[in-house]
């Protein structure tokens, strides 16, 4: 259940996250699974552990194998496995299937291609982008933060896109490349001002003190793929991440597409062990896209 495949190219940086994630304060120990030998944490080593991350700076083919991470969480030490494969650089332009990240689809309205795994690295903009090994040039291509945007997408924009960036570790630079396929969907999509399906505005939900409850924020933004569509919860006007109450957690937004083609997003707010003070909070469901922001408020009340 907590095993993950990771791959990279020799002489490039590879950073792998422990599939068994814990809180940032938890100590994580890394081992070579075959030998049970501990991986050092000193940064002078080519391969070293840094909390939840295992760093190969740079990677070698011989690094391939299974690595064990043990998260020293309270009560249990929880184990994860990272299956790492390092490949030799390809002499030609062809990127084999085993080096490809997940395929993304785009349309005329939405043509974002994210650079895979980039969030694990210490990189600075701009990214370099290549299509079928050719550097992308021209005003149609915009490298924006960690993704590429293509204006006026056409069917012949489909292909393999490679992002290239530099990872910096203590002043040393390491190259990283990642490739994924892009397919073009011919769909007549549109975007409109967000419509919140749930909760109803100024709704009140009955809860029992001491029990768990979920609040779902569900909004639709138009038809087809959307360029920007976010759904999130706020507590008393503050982001969940700024509200330091570990009992209240927001799940990542889940995309939904209905039979009528509507593009909708659901985000669930999980409240564990409901307390009296939770009844005093204002829970705002926020839906945002390029057209604007819509907000619905819900409050909790004690079940009679």
């Amino acid at each position: 259940k907590f095993s993950k495949q990771s791959w990279g190219l020799e002489n490039e940086a590879l950073i792998v996250r422990c599939p068994r994630q814990g809180k940032s304060s938890y100590i994580v120990d890394w081992y070579y699974s075959q030998t049970n030998k501990s991986i050092p944490t000193q940064e002078r080593n080519r391969v070293f552990a840094s909390g939840q991350l295992l760093k190969f700076l740079p990677a070698e083919v011989a690094d391939s194998g299974i690595y064990t991470c043990i998260v020293r969480s309270p009560t249990f030490n929880r184990t994860g496995y990272a299956n790492v494969t390092i490949y030799k650089k390809q002499p030609d332009c062809n990127v084999p299937d085993y080096l490809m990240y997940s395929t993304v689809s785009g349309s005329e309205k939405n043509s974002k291609i994210y650079c895979p795994t980039i969030d694990l690295y210490n990189w600075t903009a701009p990214l370099e982008w290549f299509k079928n090994c050719q550097a992308l040039q021209g005003s149609r291509y915009k490298a924006h933060k960690s993704f590429l945007v293509i204006d006026n997408v056409m069917t012949d924009d489909a292909g393999d896109y490679t992002c290239k960036f530099i990872h910096n570790e203590n002043g040393a630079n390491y190259s990283v490349t990642a490739t994924r396929s892009f397919t073009v969907k011919d769909e007549q999509g549109f975007s409109r001002f967000p419509v919140i399906r749930a909760p109803a505005h100024n709704e009140t939900k009955e809860v029992e003190i001491g029990e768990n409850t979920n609040l779902t924020c569900s909004a639709c933004f138009g038809k087809g793929a959307q360029f920007l569509a976010t759904v999130q919860w706020q507590l008393n006007g503050n982001k969940i991440t700024d509200f330091s109450e570990p009992r209240i957690q927001q799940e990542e937004g889940q995309n939904q597409s209905f039979s009528n083609g509507l593009a909708c997003v659901n985000t669930v707010l999980r409240i564990a062990d409901v307390k009296e003070e939770d009844l005093l909070l204002r829970y705002d469901c926020l839906a945002l896209n390029l057209h604007g922001l819509r907000r619905h408020t819900i409050r909790l009340s004690r079940k009679n």
């Epitope: 259940k1 809180k23 309270p74």
Partner: antibody, heavy 122, light 111 residues
Framework: EVQLVESGGGLVQPGGSLRLSCAAS????????MHWIRQAPGKNLEWVSA???????YYPGSVKGRFTISREDAKNSLYLQMNSLRAGDTAVYYC????????????????WGQGTTVTVSS | DIVMTQSPLSLPVTPGEPASISCRSS???????????LDWYLQKPGQSPQLLIY???NRASGVPDRFTGSGSGTDFTLKISRVEAEDVGVYYC????????FGGGTKVEIK
């Protein structure tokens, strides 16, 4: 209502086997670490086994190799398979909810079942 | 394994008076996340145990505020500000830092 209900206890001969079940309701069972805790007659509480949301299992030396904990999230159920039972295993066995293994939140062993009695005797 | 030692073994109390139970662990119960993984439980006669205090000092839902948990490192205390008749039973401390270990219990009874 958050609830745990144990079943499967009974009288068994030394060397015999027994399977305890625990039915959970009122909470998202699949995200929680679950425990079996026992109490011998007139004695204090003793932790017997645990299983986390990944299905990884944990045992003390006294039962390792004899007891097997398992979970069936689709049925909101926890099990304890007890083999090679000894007189010293005689106790009330409690099913109990541990921390939220998904968010790594811990609020104590906050839900306990009513217990099921296991008697090992010839 | 972490060993938990409770005292006293038995505690006769007078209703309305305060009571205090001590618990000591064989090693610090402080985790790298900054919390002490020490809980207190009450087992009333003929009932399952019930959670009173978690993470050293946090009162569980529905627990009266006359119960207070305190302490750090290896030494912890449960205080009852004014004992009531319904508070009788066996009190257990439990560490949850490394698996679970219970203390030997303290039997609280009315004088």
């Amino acid at each position: 209502e958050v609830q745990l209900v144990e079943s499967g206890g009974g009288l068994v001969q030394p060397g015999g086997s027994l399977r305890l079940s625990c039915a959970a309701s009122g909470f998202t069972f699949s995200t929680y670490d679950m425990h079996w805790i026992r109490q011998a007659p007139g004695k204090n509480l003793e932790w017997v086994s645990a299983i986390d949301l990944a299905g990884d299992t944990y045992y003390p030396g006294s039962v390792k190799g004899r007891f097997t904990i398992s979970r069936e999230d689709a049925k909101n159920s926890l099990y304890l398979q007890m083999n090679s039972l000894r007189a010293g295993d005689t106790a009330v066995y409690y099913c109990a909810r541990g921390g939220d293994g998904y968010n790594y939140d811990y609020y104590g062993i906050d839900v306990w079942g009513q217990g099921t009695t296991v008697t090992v005797s010839s | 394994d972490i060993v938990m030692t409770q005292s006293p073994l038995s505690l006769p109390v007078t209703p309305g008076e305060p009571a205090s139970i001590s618990c000591r662990s064989s090693q610090s119960l402080l985790h790298s996340d900054g919390y002490h993984y020490l809980d207190w439980y009450l087992q009333k006669p003929g009932q399952s145990p019930q959670l009173l205090i978690y993470l050293g000092s946090n009162r569980a839902s529905g627990v009266p505020d006359r119960f207070t948990g305190s302490g750090s490192g290896t030494d912890f205390t449960l205080k009852i500000s004014r004992v009531e008749a319904e508070d009788v039973g066996v009190y257990y401390c439990m560490q949850a830092l490394q698996i679970l270990t219970f203390g030997g219990g303290t039997k609280v009874e009315i004088k």
